[in-house]
């Protein structure tokens, strides 16, 4: 009976999310393998988040708008492990907007989700950021490694969206 009611709850939750995401990919997790964590198909999952690589070329504002239409934000990178996971799926000759910007050019960098900007957990390429006119951050491959670079916000780039996993 308990299992039956849990299944019914799950199904109704799935139907609710179906309006926004036509298809979800879910995995069982938790100590009793009773919880399901889901990401929209074809997003990828890492820890408690889902990620989507957008290959359409857009300005930073449009890229954030595009992520938000999908219920997400431009990616906020919190750890080296997270960055390493994300970069597995990126093309080395492309650049991708991050959810990091310096709106006034005062070198006050801020994440789109208001996560505090911690200088000790940043992955800028050597010599970057280097220009107060370049107020948005990208991740790209340079000198044999992935790192961040400041760029002009209005020049179209690919982007990475991130959202919390859906638990049902």
């Amino acid at each position: 009976n308990f299992m039956y009611s849990k299944t019914v709850k799950r199904l109704s939750k799935l139907q609710e999310y179906q309006q926004y995401y036509p298809s979800l990919t879910c995995v069982m997790e938790g100590k009793d393998m009773e919880d399901w964590s889901c990401c929209p198909t074809p997003w990828t999952s890492f820890q408690s988040s889902c990620y989507f690589i957008s290959t359409v070329m857009q300005s930073w504002t449009k890229s954030q708008n595009n992520c938000s239409v999908m219920g997400a934000d431009l990616v906020v990178i919190n750890t080296k492990e997270e960055q390493d996971f994300i970069t597995q799926n990126l093309k080395i000759n492309s650049a991708y907007f991050l959810g990091l910007s310096d709106p006034k050019g005062w070198r006050h960098w801020q994440w789109v989700d208001q996560t505090p900007y911690n200088k000790n957990v940043t992955f800028w390429h050597s010599g970057e950021p280097n220009s107060p006119d370049e107020r948005c951050a990208i991740i790209n491959f340079r000198s044999e490694e992935w790192g961040w670079n400041d760029v002009h916000c209005h020049v179209p780039q690919k982007s990475i969206c991130k959202m919390k996993k859906i638990y049902i």
């Epitope: 857009q58 300005s59 449009k62 002009h152 916000c153 209005h154 020049v155």
Partner: antibody, heavy 120, light 107 residues
């Protein structure tokens, strides 16, 4: 004030390459924005061909990808269009324009355009 | 690519009249739409960006509106200098495509 000016041959033979130059004054092409080539066919249809960004990266219209190359000479503040294997279908007025104004909401600065005819 | 369908293809009107040109996108372009005016033998001039924002110096008789996939440019009290061709262009995702144009002629 930002000004753009196209130049190049007005007549190109089929199967040859079309080469055009856009000279920019009033703004350094390495300081910002992205720098486009746009063409307008005889029936007035407009097409974005591709661009080069202030930091030198390119993006091309997929319909032209195998034939197009956009490069620049930063010392002369110029950028260039090369279109290979042209046919009569490439007859058009070619414009250069700056992209990225109004948070990339419209092309505010255009050259006057140069007519290129492809004919034997 | 997002396709832009503009109508009408041509339009005849008199000085003082009000005209409306419409543009339909094949997908949601989230208000990232520009309108241009082009006179014979000249390059296009940007009039409106982000669907409804007028470029500095453009007369207030021009106005843009719309959302989603449907947009329009309205010109109130037509002046002789308003005659020419008008084009819409979306700025949502590369490549930015143009509408086919509307030729506005004096009746």
């Amino acid at each position: 004030d930002v000004q753009l000016q196209e130049s190049g041959p007005g007549l190109v033979k089929p199967s040859q390459s079309l080469s055009l130059t856009c000279s920019v004054t009033g703004y350094s092409i390495t300081s910002g924005y992205y720098w486009n080539w746009i063409r307008q066919f005889p029936g007035n249809k407009l097409e974005c061909m591709g661009y080069i960004t202030y930091d030198g990266s390119n993006n091309y219209n997929p319909s032209l990808k195998d034939r197009i190359s956009i490069t620049r000479d930063t010392s002369k503040n110029q950028f260039f269009l090369k279109l290979n294997s042209v046919t009569t279908e490439d007859t058009a007025t070619y414009y250069c324009a700056r992209g990225g104004d109004y948070d990339d909401g419209g092309f505010a600065y255009w050259g006057h355009g140069t007519l290129v005819t492809v004919s034997a | 690519d997002i396709q832009m369908t503009q109508s009408p293809v041509s339009l005849s009107a008199s000085v003082g009249e009000t005209v409306t040109i419409t543009c339909r996108a094949s997908g949601n372009i989230h208000n990232y739409l520009a309108w241009y005016q082009q006179k014979q033998g000249k390059s296009p001039q940007l009039l409106v960006y982000n669907a409804k924002s007028l470029v500095d110096g453009v007369p207030s008789r021009f106005s843009g509106s719309g959302s989603g996939t449907q947009y329009s440019l309205k010109i109130n009290s037509l002046q002789p200098e308003d005659f020419g061709s008008y084009y819409c262009q979306h700025f949502w995702i590369i490549p930015y495509t143009f509408g086919g144009g509307t030729k506005l002629e004096i009746k």
